[in-house]
């Protein structure tokens, strides 16, 4: 025998109390499969959430961050404050990045400059707690004597075209 | 159901003190740092304080550091803030709200927040 609940569609459900017919959901919940028992509840958006998607009666209501936070986790289950470029957040609220680390955004972490002398280069542009910092060329390549004119490119024969 | 329910707005002049309720239900308070939330009109929203589990960590954004104290009576499942001191650039609709799970640690994210109460300082 066929369950009779089978043929109740999304945004139904299967009423117990009424000879197992289908009943709409009820307002503010939603089925968004067929055969269902119960209507679940929307879920609400409201203080630091603000409505993306209205709840429907076969789908549930999506919610991002009022402006000032940014959305955290999947379907936006938190909203985590946003700070300036050149801050990071911790317990205390928004922080200015210590000196010798920079984020160039509104959320994360403050991260160090990156360290040019590792890669054998110097420091072109110096870092801020907005921006890294650039690197340049290596030391060697400015070191006294060392040309800094770009070499001439090799002659090609007349009647030649480029590669 | 969890929910969050604020009240004790309302108009006050400026210099004037107001005392916010929050009163926390279907979770267990005792578990959860909690925040104070504003947003005043036309503007973004801003945090304002918080408060571990059991009260002995309290931070404030530095525009309400000592004129406002957020406390929490975790036995009445009650959160609050005591604000006095009161200036028009206070006016905003407040909101408590619930650190997620990990806040502090891995996050600063809130997860659940309530329908606000509206303080209007004006003379």
């Known amino acids: 025998l066929q369950d009779p609940c089978s043929n109740c569609p999304a945004g139904t459900f299967c009423d117990n109390n009424r000879n197992q017919i289908c009943s709409p959901c009820p307002p503010n919940s939603f089925s968004s499969a067929g055969g269902q028992r119960t209507c679940d509840i929307c879920r609400q958006c409201k203080g630091v959430f603000r409505t993306r998607k209205e709840c429907s009666s076969t789908s549930n209501a999506e919610c991002d961050c009022t402006p000032g936070f940014h959305c955290l986790g999947a379907g936006c289950s938190m909203c985590e404050q946003d700070c300036k470029q050149g801050q990071e957040l911790t317990k205390k609220g928004c922080k200015d990045c210590c000196f010798g680390t920079f984020n160039d955004q509104k959320r994360g972490i403050c991260r160090p400059w990156t360290n040019c002398s590792l890669d054998g280069k110097s420091v072109l542009v110096n870092g801020t707690k907005e921006r890294d910092v650039v690197c340049g060329p290596s030391p060697a390549d400015l070191s006294p004597g060392a040309s800094s004119v770009t070499p001439p490119a090799p002659a090609r024969e007349p009647g030649h075209s480029p590669q | 159901q969890v929910q969050l329910v604020e009240s004790g707005g309302g108009l006050v002049q400026p210099g004037g003190s107001l005392r916010l309720s929050c009163a926390a239900s279907?979770?267990?308070?005792?578990n959860y740092w909690m925040n104070w939330v504003r947003q005043a009109p036309g503007k973004g929203l801003e945090w304002?304080?918080?408060?571990?589990?059991?009260?002995?960590?309290?931070y404030y954004v530095d525009s309400v550091k000592g004129r406002f104290t957020i406390s929490r009576d975790n036995a009445k499942n009650s959160l609050y803030l005591q604000m006095s001191s009161l200036r028009a650039e206070d006016t905003a609709v407040y909101f408590c709200?619930?650190?997620?799970?990990?806040?502090?640690?891995?996050?600063?994210?809130?997860?659940?927040s309530g329908q606000g109460t509206t303080v209007t300082v004006s003379s």
């Open positions: 709200a619930r650190g997620g799970e990990g806040y502090g640690v891995d996050h600063y994210g809130l997860d659940v």
């Open positions: 279907g979770f267990t308070l005792s």
């Open positions: 304002v304080a918080n408060i571990n589990q059991d009260g002995s960590e309290r």
